[in-house]
């Protein structure tokens, strides 16, 4: 049997023996186009590529629609995998997402969405969610129907506000919404009323800002 | 179309109670703090009072704490206000508003109902 | 309570010539997050307020933008870039940075 030799996610990746946490390079669906990921191998039986990750403020994610786009920051640490390499991905499949949060006084809760995929650029990598489960809070603190993703330079939000501006990062802001995992990092006893943080409301309330975030994805049928 | 819709002004006694209601619609009013506004005749705005999205958290400014009293209903997206003991002082146009920025995020008052003039007069 | 105090109070403007309105706190209005909770908000003759600017500095969508807000701390401004007759009404000054909210006694703006 021939070894692959390109993976399109960290599932396919793991499936081929390669079961360590780490940086790998993965393949653009229908593409050669590659883009370096962090793969989970640990969590809830590995295989989880991770496209989000905050855990020290050490980069900026206020960041334009472009840098969203293509992602930004390091593997390794604080990063924004990329919106169209996400997009393109669960286009194809069905992958169920799980996030993870960490807040300031050592307790852990997450969220997992039974399905999840972003629209295309066209329709602004618009996110769709179904089936919560989860610590993280019994509603999602993602708004449903999903919404638009929103940077700075970019307003696709449904408030007369510009959310992305005033609430800092690119998400999938509605008016503005109840969660913010892009929003401004705040450490330690810092991290309280500050509407502009790291949110998510279901679990912490509006003006709690979390340690850290980690969001990751896996084919549903891992 | 975000709408505040407002009614239960009009003229009472000093002493008596009045209950003004507000009926919002274009919205998901279970997500938006609210609150009441006044503007005695020819004078300025004053904030009257707040109440959070799920009602969990009330605040009174000192000159109506003890006699006005808000709520809300999601189910029937509306907001309330129920005046007690009025006052001449109390004669005033009232506005419902709403935050600018849901799940009480108090940025200013995004939108205004059409304002009730509440008349107390003996 | 904190205290807003507006000038002018009446503003009598040529359209098209510029206008300027002050907002002065008695305390400053920098929140810990960065930003100050001040907006500005104009009421037109017979009108319920309707927002301007948010935040010190944001304009809400659908006001023009001739109108813009800055300042800081105690100090803050509004500006009209070029008055025109719409823009008459009184505009009010409100901050939310420390409970209760409060506003200023407005500023009249009338065309000569």
């Known amino acids: 049997k021939e070894e692959q030799t390109t993976f399109r996610d960290c599932a396919e990746i793991f499936k081929s023996g390669l079961t360590t946490s780490g940086i790998y390079t993965l393949t653009f669906p229908n593409s050669t186009e590659e883009i370096k990921a962090y793969c989970d191998m640990d969590v809830g039986g590995g295989g989880w590529t991770v496209i989000q990750h905050r855990e020290d403020g050490s980069v900026d994610f206020q960041r334009t629609w472009k840098e969203y786009k293509e992602g930004f920051g390091s593997p390794l640490g604080e990063y924004w995998l990329g919106n169209e390499f996400v997009s393109q991905l669960t286009g194809q499949h069905r992958y169920v997402l799980k996030i993870q949060l960490k807040d300031w006084e050592g307790n852990e809760a997450h969220s997992l969405y039974d399905h999840f995929y972003l629209a295309g650029e066209e329709s602004n990598y618009r996110i769709h969610l179904t089936g919560l489960t989860g610590t993280a809070g019994k509603i999602s603190s993602i708004s449903q129907p999903g919404s638009d993703f929103s940077t700075k330079d970019s307003d696709n939000d449904k408030c007369i506000c510009k959310c992305s501006q005033m609430l800092s990062g690119g998400w999938w802001f509605d008016a503005c919404g109840p969660s913010n995992l892009n929003g401004q990092y705040y450490p330690q006893k810092q991290n309280t009323n500050k509407f502009n943080g790291i949110k998510w409301y279901y679990w912490k309330g509006s003006g709690y800002s979390l340690k850290a975030t980690t969001m990751m994805i896996r084919p549903a049928d891992f | 179309e975000v709408q505040l819709v407002q009614s239960g002004g009009g003229v009472v006694q000093p002493g008596r109670s009045l209950r003004l209601s507000c009926a919002a619609s274009g919205f998901t009013f279970s997500s938006y703090g609210m609150h009441w506004v006044r503007q005695a005749p020819g004078k300025g705005l004053e904030w009257v009072s707040y109440?959070?999205?799920?009602?969990?958290?009330?605040y009174y400014a000192d000159s109506v704490k003890g006699r006005f009293t808000i709520s809300r209903d999601n189910a029937k997206n509306s907001l309330y206000l129920q005046m007690n003991s009025l006052r001449a002082e109390d004669t005033a146009v009232y506005y419902c508003a709403r935050d600018l920025l849901d799940y009480d995020i108090l940025t200013g008052y995004g939108y205004w109902g059409q304002g009730t003039l509440v008349t107390v007069s003996s | 309570d904190i205290v807003m105090t507006q000038s002018p109070l009446s503003l009598p403007v040529t359209p098209g010539e510029p206008a300027s309105i002050s907002c002065r706190s008695s305390q400053s209005l920098l929140h810990s997050n960065g930003y100050n909770y001040l907006d500005w908000y104009l009421q037109k003759p017979g009108q319920s307020p309707q927002l301007l600017i948010y935040l010190g500095s944001n304009r809400a969508s659908g006001v023009p933008d001739r109108f813009s807000g800055s300042g800081s701390g105690t100090d803050f401004t509004l500006k009209i870039s070029r008055v025109e007759a719409e823009d008459v009404g009184v505009y009010y000054c409100m901050q939310g940075t420390h409970w209760p909210p409060t506003f200023g006694q407005g500023t009249k703006l009338e065309i000569k």
């Open positions: 109440i959070s999205s799920s009602g969990s958290t009330i």
